[in-house]
């Protein structure tokens, strides 16, 4: 079941998943000057069964000048924001990721892919946050968010992370320096 909205935005932080649950969509987005091919998929889909999962469909980009019913316009000016979704940096692959049943690995990049990946997550997905370069992480608890189904509605738990403007970066799980977390795992459940 798809999550109704996106994971929470944390100022000066980005998030990523270590693996993607079956049913996850990854939009086929192309970099500026390119677009999905006319007969190209809208998204890639993590599909399969408990023993083997893989990405269905392939994203393909072509020059946007090649099709007369596609236009490229200059977007309205807006404030520059930190990217909140997975950026195309070198993806970090935990060694055990492939062995997670019902999950897909980070898909390899496709030619002329956009710099930012847009995922549609499913219930049960967990994402991990890290501060962007130049910001330091202050943890009150886990720097993660989980999409949960509560009373027929989906929602993301609130990650316990604050990024402060000090020149030190925090890493994703597996590369993180141990930090004291005196409080227990914070409950961000909401009653209804």
């Amino acid at each position: 079941e798809l999550c109704d909205d996106d994971p929470p935005e944390i100022p000066h932080a980005t998030f990523k998943a270590m693996a993607y649950k079956e049913g996850t969509m990854l939009n086929c987005e192309c970099k500026r000057g390119f677009r999905r091919i006319k007969s190209g998929s809208l998204y890639m889909l993590c599909t399969g069964n408990s023993s083997h999962s893989s990405w269905d469909n392939q994203c393909q980009c072509t020059s946007s000048a090649t099709r007369n019913t596609t236009k490229q316009v200059t977007p309205q000016p807006e404030e520059q924001k930190e990217r909140k979704t997975t950026e195309m940096q070198s993806p970090m692959q935990p060694v055990d990721q492939a062995s997670l049943p019902g999950h897909c690995r980070e898909p390899p990049p496709w030619e002329n892919e956009a710099t930012e990946r847009i995922y549609h997550f499913v219930v049960g997905q967990m994402v991990y946050y890290q501060c962007v370069q130049g910001y330091r992480a202050l943890h009150r608890g886990p720097a993660e968010s989980v999409c949960k189904m509560t009373h027929g509605k989906t929602r993301w738990t609130q990650p316990q992370l604050i990024c402060t403007g000090e020149m030190e970066t925090s890493q994703f799980p597996g590369e993180e320096k141990p930090q004291a977390s005196p409080e227990g795992r914070p409950e961000s459940e909401t009653s209804c």
Partner: antibody, heavy 114, light 107 residues
């Protein structure tokens, strides 16, 4: 929660144009395509086109090229569709959709009448 | 353009029954098919994506199946609130196209 707000109705004269809005809330507007769908009784649903507010791309169904013009304003998280040279054939409900068709607006009923 | 054909415009069923709404694509669309439910006076609601995956909040009595050119939306244990029109849609190739709709009537 994701919401797409559209005005309920527009009454317009033949030969004129109309510009309808779709205000998005509850998600990052610039990340997702916004599409437009036409519904007329007996004609089912027709996809008009879509726009990527962040990337600035627009795709049109060739049937609506010259009829519909799609724009988006990221500062107000609002998408717009302008329909020109209106005739009775343009009387319909127009829906905006987003997040891979997961979310639909309530629709704007356009009535073209003298 | 790819045509999506829902051959049955109307289907009649009873509460508790199982009903299957079918949709045929004019060419192979893989599993790039969605199903929508539209109740009278309301906007369409997304039920199924990628032929067989349910959106959140959609009861599990709604099941999608098929690939290639033939697709089915099955409603098991039909409830009175399922009275609606059901549309299929392909998003395999521009322009995205919809089926003509199947109206489900409850006896």
């Amino acid at each position: 929660q994701v919401q797409l707000q559209q005005p309920g109705a527009e009454l317009v004269r033949p030969g004129t144009s109309v510009k309808m809005s779709c205000k998005a809330a509850g998600y990052t507007f610039s990340n997702y395509w916004i599409g437009w769908v036409k519904q007329r009784p007996g004609h089912g649903l027709e996809w008009i086109g879509d726009i990527h507010p962040g990337g600035g791309y627009i795709n049109y169904n060739e049937k609506f090229t010259g009829k519909a013009t799609l724009t988006a304003d990221t500062s107000s998280s609002t998408a717009y569709m302008q329909l020109s040279s209106l005739t009775s054939e343009d009387s319909a409900i127009y829906y905006c959709v987003s997040r891979n068709f997961a979310n639909w607006g309530q629709g704007t009923l356009v009535t073209v009448s003298a | 353009d790819i045509q999506m054909t829902q051959s049955q415009k109307f289907m009649s069923t009873s509460v508790g029954d199982r009903v299957s709404v079918t949709c045929k694509a004019s060419q192979n669309v893989g599993t790039n098919v969605a199903w929508y439910q539209q109740k009278p006076g309301q906007s369409p609601k997304a039920l199924i994506y990628s032929a067989s995956y349910r959106y959140s909040g959609v009861p599990d009595r709604f099941t999608g199946s098929g690939s290639g050119t033939d697709f089915t939306l099955t409603i098991s244990n039909v409830q009175s609130e399922d009275l609606a029109e059901y549309f299929c849609q392909q998003y395999n190739s521009y322009p995205w196209t919809f089926g003509g709709g199947t109206k489900l009537e409850i006896k």
